[in-house]
Interface confidence: low
């Protein structure tokens, strides 16, 4: 499919001008290659009329130009002094005319309306209001006032001062007679329809002395604004319908076959299932304007969109509307990233978020999409050290791997974490991407004790158990804070108060805190990574308390005395300890038990490797 995009239809009137914008992917090659506008012949060729290399056909001499805007990825063809001979099928394109890097444009130039003398022309947008003013002389002040519409050869009464209203105008028309001082009556028509267009005649009086005034009403269907966005990117539709509909329900719909317009989202709470998790309707301003953001653009999102206002929250005849033609460029600069990430309850996910690599200094954000009402996306974390309070200790945004991708890690997962999340920055708003987190059945791969209490001045070791499949990964412990998770040095990196030791045989990576102080209290994460790509993490909170007086019983030991069949959920190791109390031989078999479990984990993970659009908790 050609990535070139422009207006499918351009309509104008003889003598007028048109300006046609064509969009192209702004790659280095495209920015500098030839741009052209050609007319399609009956036999399939396309004859160049104007190009960016300076050529102008004699047909266009002195009345056309082509301007390239490489920074926007657009070029504009302006044609003046239009005649009906200019009607036809054209192409705007890049490179060679026959190469197919082009877009078909139909230009229709019509004759200007043949109007009677003294005809007032009213040009009004579809769905809006028109006021037709009708002057009269004093002798007709007390006589019947009326408005007719010319239908074919015959005038048809629309409204009159005796109270008649044509059924086609019921509920949306009124006749106002000004105060005695002004010799004028006016007819106000609301919620204009395309069928309202035509020639009108207003009349005061019915005899040969009546006053008459001709009016020509032109109802304009809004020209769609062309919107060119990248696949997987984001689009924002800004809809300003005017203060007169400020209190009317708003909608955005997508035109399907014919005149149907399927609601995408509206202010009455309706949302199309295809847009779940990737759409926000920003609440409207006092003047009735609002905007709709759609992320994670798909090929099938391309098409014509209308926003409007109607009490039903959907398109009806007479709704004021605004239109867009969305083209989704498949030659996207936005890299593929998983749209679904799976994690298990108690486990973690690492989400890769793309951003525009030209904006490496931009602030990165992650928010949780909420579908209630019109949708919103409250921030959970940013790259400047802010984390929403409820997520402290279990959420971190990392600038790694960098170069167009940042990482978000969320652990201690529960079913409540399932949902849609958005990656965004304070820079290029087109680079908003959506990922869905799904919570699936399974056990976390990394196991740490549930609660750890350290004693001031003593040494603490905290184990983290990992399965065979992570043997080749780098293991680490880090101390969580708002700005990230600061990795603690491993034992062989030299003496340190806090360090990490890994025993590959028992597959334990342990955190050691020497001479515990109050400053050591907090969240610690055990994790695995490959280079700058983060995998699973497990979190443990280390509480610090005073040394107890001699003879007082340590509550943490009491927990270990749980009955053998009791499932203590705060530790992956506790289950093994309890079995050992029951049967001392299990101490010797502890490693074997762990091995069996790990192999099961490994085989399960290999089955659910996920599609190219999905990513497991280990996020590669």
């Amino acid at each position: 499919k050609s990535p070139i995009f422009g207006p499918e239809e351009v309509n104008s009137v003889e003598g007028n001008s048109v300006s046609i914008t064509c969009y192209y992917p702004p790659t280095s090659v495209n920015r500098h290659t030839r741009k052209y506008w050609c007319r399609q012949g009956a036999r399939g060729g396309c004859i160049t009329l104007i190009s960016s290399e300076g050529y102008v056909s004699s047909k266009y001499a002195g009345r056309a130009n082509l301007t390239n805007f490489p920074e926007n990825g657009t070029f504009v063809v302006n044609i003046a002094q239009l005649s009906q001979d200019d009607s036809g099928r054209y192409k705007c394109g890049l490179g060679i005319n026959s190469r197919g890097l082009s877009f078909d444009v139909s230009l229709e130039v019509s004759q200007g309306p043949g109007l009677l003398n003294d005809t007032k022309v009213y040009t009004v947008d579809l769905g809006r209001t028109v006021t037709i003013n009708c002057p009269f002389k004093t002798e007709n002040a007390q006589k019947r006032k009326s408005l007719y519409k010319q239908i074919g050869l015959y005038p048809v009464l629309v409204i009159d001062s005796s109270g008649y209203v044509n059924p086609n105008y019921t509920g949306r028309i009124r006749l106002d007679i000004q105060g005695t001082g002004q010799l004028l009556f006016s007819v106000v028509i609301n919620q204009l329809r395309l069928s309202d267009a035509g020639q009108y005649l207003c009349q005061a009086g019915d005899d040969s002395n009546s006053n008459k005034k001709n009016a020509d009403l032109q109802v304009l269907k809004p020209e769609p604004e062309l919107v060119y966005e990248d696949l997987r990117g984001s689009v924002t539709f800004h809809c300003a319908l005017g203060p007169e509909v400020a209190n009317v329900a708003k909608f955005l719909c997508r035109q399907s076959s014919g005149e149907n317009c399927d609601v995408v989202v509206n202010t009455l709470g309706k949302r199309a299932p295809a847009f779940e998790g990737r759409i926000l309707l920003n609440p409207q301003d006092k003047d009735g304007s609002f905007s709709v953001v759609i992320t994670g653009l798909r090929k099938e999102d391309a098409g014509r969109y209308l926003c409007g206002a109607h009490s039903d929250g959907q398109l009806q005849e007479g709704s004021p509307i605004q239109a867009w033609q969305l083209f989704v460029n498949e030659e996207s600069t936005i890299p593929r990233s998983p749209t679904v990430v799976k994690g298990v309850a108690g486990g973690s996910v690492a989400v890769l978020c793309p951003y525009n690599r030209k904006e490496s200094k931009s602030i990165k954000y992650w928010c949780l999409w909420e579908g209630a009402q019109n949708g919103r996306c409250p921030l959970l974390v940013d790259s400047e050290g802010w984390v929403k309070a409820q997520y402290e200790g279990r959420l971190s945004l990392l600038e790694e791997p960098g170069n167009g991708t940042f990482t978000v890690i969320l652990n201690q997962l529960t079913s409540r974490d399932a949902g849609f999340y958005w990656c965004l920055t304070n820079g290029d708003t087109l680079w908003r991407t959506t990922v869905e987190i799904k919570i699936i059945e399974g056990e976390p791969n990394l196991k740490v004790p549930g609660n750890v209490t350290a004693v001031l001045g003593e040494t603490l070791k905290v184990p983290c158990h990992f399965p065979c499949k992570f043997s080749s990964y780098e293991k680490y412990w880090c101390k969580w804070n708002n700005t990230g998770c600061q990795a603690l040095p491993s034992q062989d990196e030299g003496p340190s108060k806090a360090f990490v030791n890994c025993d590959e045989n028992s597959r334990l990576v342990s955190l050691t805190l020497n001479l515990v102080t109050r400053a050591d209290e907090g969240w610690y994460w055990c994790g695995v990574k490959q280079g700058h790509f983060y995998g699973e993490t497990a979190a443990v909170y280390v509480a610090v308390e005073e040394r107890k007086a001699a003879g007082s019983r340590d509550v943490s030991l009491a927990k270990a005395d749980a009955a053998p069949d009791e499932k203590v959920l705060d530790s992956g190791f506790r289950e093994i300890e309890n079995k050992a109390i029951q049967d001392p031989r299990l101490f010797a078999e502890e490693k074997a038990v762990a091995d069996t479990r790990d192999q099961a984990d490994g085989s399960r993970a290999s089955v659910d490797s996920g599609s190219s659009e999905e990513q497991g908790g280990s996020s590669r």
Epitope: N282, D285, S291
Partner: nanobody, 125 residues
């Protein structure tokens, strides 16, 4: 464009209270999609962060110098954000500015996109 107009400034005695309001208007997205912040600038000094509040009003953040004395709230129905200042000190004398941001960030580096003109608060000893 978002327009912000502060009000409520004036001359008060040390130890008194004062309430500043900021009214938002404009044609862009609605008020309840913006995070709001308060800053102040004392004569001859740089503008400094005072407090911030997210769009829902659920998250607030304060500069250490005002913590416990100032409270920031918002009323999305009325498009206003309020800074309640108690136990005022002469050191609180400054022009107070209201700011709006398209995103909320707790901390003193509030990412303001729009600013008001300011309202003067003078605390005499």
């Amino acid at each position: 464009q978002v327009q912000l107009v502060e009000s409520g400034g004036g001359l008060v005695q040390a130890g008194d209270s004062l309430r500043l309001s900021c009214a938002a208007s404009g044609r862009t997205l609605s008020f309840d999609t913006y995070a709001m912040g308060w800053f102040r600038q004392a004569p001859g000094k740089e503008r400094e962060f005072v407090a911030s509040i997210d769009w829902s009003g659920g998250t607030t953040y304060y500069a250490d110098s005002v913590k416990g004395r100032f409270t920031v709230t918002r009323d999305n129905a009325k498009n206003t954000v309020t800074l309640r200042m108690n136990s005022l000190k002469p050191a609180d004398t400054a022009v107070y500015y209201c700011a709006a941001a398209q995103y909320y960030r707790s901390g003193t580096s509030f990412p303001a996109n729009y600013w008001g003109q300011g309202t003067l608060v003078t605390v005499s000893s």
